[in-house]
């Protein structure tokens, strides 16, 4: 129980895509402000988004320090203009978030087909290796750098004249598929982490078709 004019945050929700991670909560503040704290299970609490009237807090900088750790956040409520005020128990009112393990739970962002090249009856399709906000030695790591072979891509490909989608899979960012000579094909890719039980798939990439500028055709 806090002071009469503050309410505890609720519906604390992690929103995370390719490790860009934001904690959201309710309600919109009326005469109150919020501060967020985050910690690993064994670590110390670190305060973020001090005395904010927002109902979200970007915690990316904290979670990218170790994406395999499990994090817990909490949102404190303070009366606006009187942030030293505490609840009746001598503590500000706060609510805990669910636990969050970025490596296991971050959503996979929509992939992009970088290019495709046809050589005779083979097509090489390359998926863009998206940069994340995870750093190592002052360098931003790509999605492939972070997930390694845990990340696979499924390619859906089909003749422009047909509806049936064939599939191919790779644990790199490249596909080499067989196609029929003289046929135009369309492509879409999906990122998947098969070892996960939730948040396993990305949305599909935009469809790219042969005869458009992304591709290159060489008759051999």
């Amino acid at each position: 129980s806090g002071t009469t004019n503050t309410v505890a945050a609720y519906n604390l929700t992690w929103k995370s895509t390719n490790f860009k991670t934001i904690l959201e909560w309710e309600p919109k503040p009326v005469n109150q402000v919020y501060t967020v704290q985050i910690s690993t299970k064994s670590g110390d609490w670190k305060s973020k988004c001090f005395y904010t009237t927002d109902t979200e807090c970007d915690l990316t900088d904290e979670i990218v320090k170790d994406v395999k750790q499990t994090y817990l956040a909490r949102v404190f409520s303070y009366p606006a203009g009187n942030v030293e005020s505490t609840g009746s128990a001598g503590e500000p009112l706060y609510e805990n978030s669910p636990e969050f393990t970025p490596y296991l739970e971050t959503n996979l962002g929509q992939p992009t087909i970088q290019s495709f090249e046809q050589v005779g009856t083979k097509v090489n399709v390359t998926v863009e290796d998206e940069r994340t906000l995870v750093r190592r030695n002052n360098t931003f790591l790509s999605l492939r750098d972070v997930f390694g072979k845990d990340l696979i891509y499924t390619l859906y490909y089909w003749k422009s004249s047909s509806s049936g989608k064939k599939t191919a899979k790779t644990n790199t960012n490249e596909f080499l598929i067989d196609v029929d000579k003289g046929e135009n094909y369309c492509f879409s890719v999906q990122a998947v982490i098969p070892s996960r039980t939730v948040n396993r798939k990305s949305t599909d990439s935009p469809v790219e078709c042969m005869g458009q500028e992304k591709g290159e055709f060489r008759e051999i």
Partner: antibody, heavy 120, light 107 residues
Framework: EVQLVESGGGLVQPGGSLRLSCAAS????????IHWVRQAPGKGLEWVGY????????YYADSVKGRFTISADTSKNTAYLQMNSLRAEDTAVYYC?????????????WGQGTLVTVSS | DIQMTQSPSSLSASVGDRVTITCRAS??????VAWYQQKPGKAPKLLIY???FLYSGVPSRFSGSRSGTDFTLTISSLQPEDFATYYC?????????FGQGTKVEIK
Amino acid sequence: EVQLVESGGGLVQPGGSLRLSCAASGFTIFDYIIHWVRQAPGKGLEWVGYIDPSNGYTYYADSVKGRFTISADTSKNTAYLQMNSLRAEDTAVYYCARDPQSVGSEFDYWGQGTLVTVSS
Amino acid sequence: DIQMTQSPSSLSASVGDRVTITCRASQDVNTAVAWYQQKPGKAPKLLIYSASFLYSGVPSRFSGSRSGTDFTLTISSLQPEDFATYYCQQHYTTPPTFGQGTKVEIK
């Protein structure tokens, strides 16, 4: 516990139709690919087709193309196999199976199967 | 479509025997081959995936290997519960295709 349960099999006349259901529990079909595989009496396994419930993409074996349609209802966590213009050679036990979309693309869980008999 | 030619179609063996079943792919399928066990009236069960990885809960007497387009399932010491039909399957490309099956019978 992951489970797939097929239903809807039975006796149907040549040229008739039947809809099979594959009800999933213990996982959400949206996150996987669902395949249908059949096995004629005393014969081997024959792949029928797949659906990716996250985007509705499908592909069918030549032997059923134009006659069979696979669909999915993610709110019911169920995949379907609509079989039209049935022939005697479609008589088989029909299984649905889950594909975790790994590079090896194994089918890691199968239903118990439902028997479809096409006969006059 | 890729053909998976499985041999032998049947074999007789005794408990404790080492059993080898082979599948040959008609073209390169990388390691995208799985092996299944099926008993009469039951659904197939996954044994081996990605050519050589033992699926969770499968006894270690089962193993898989690859040499080019040839794939092998080995049962190091046949147990009474291993008498069944075994199928290989490729899913390197659509459509996925199965071998014709190998029935392992009691000698």
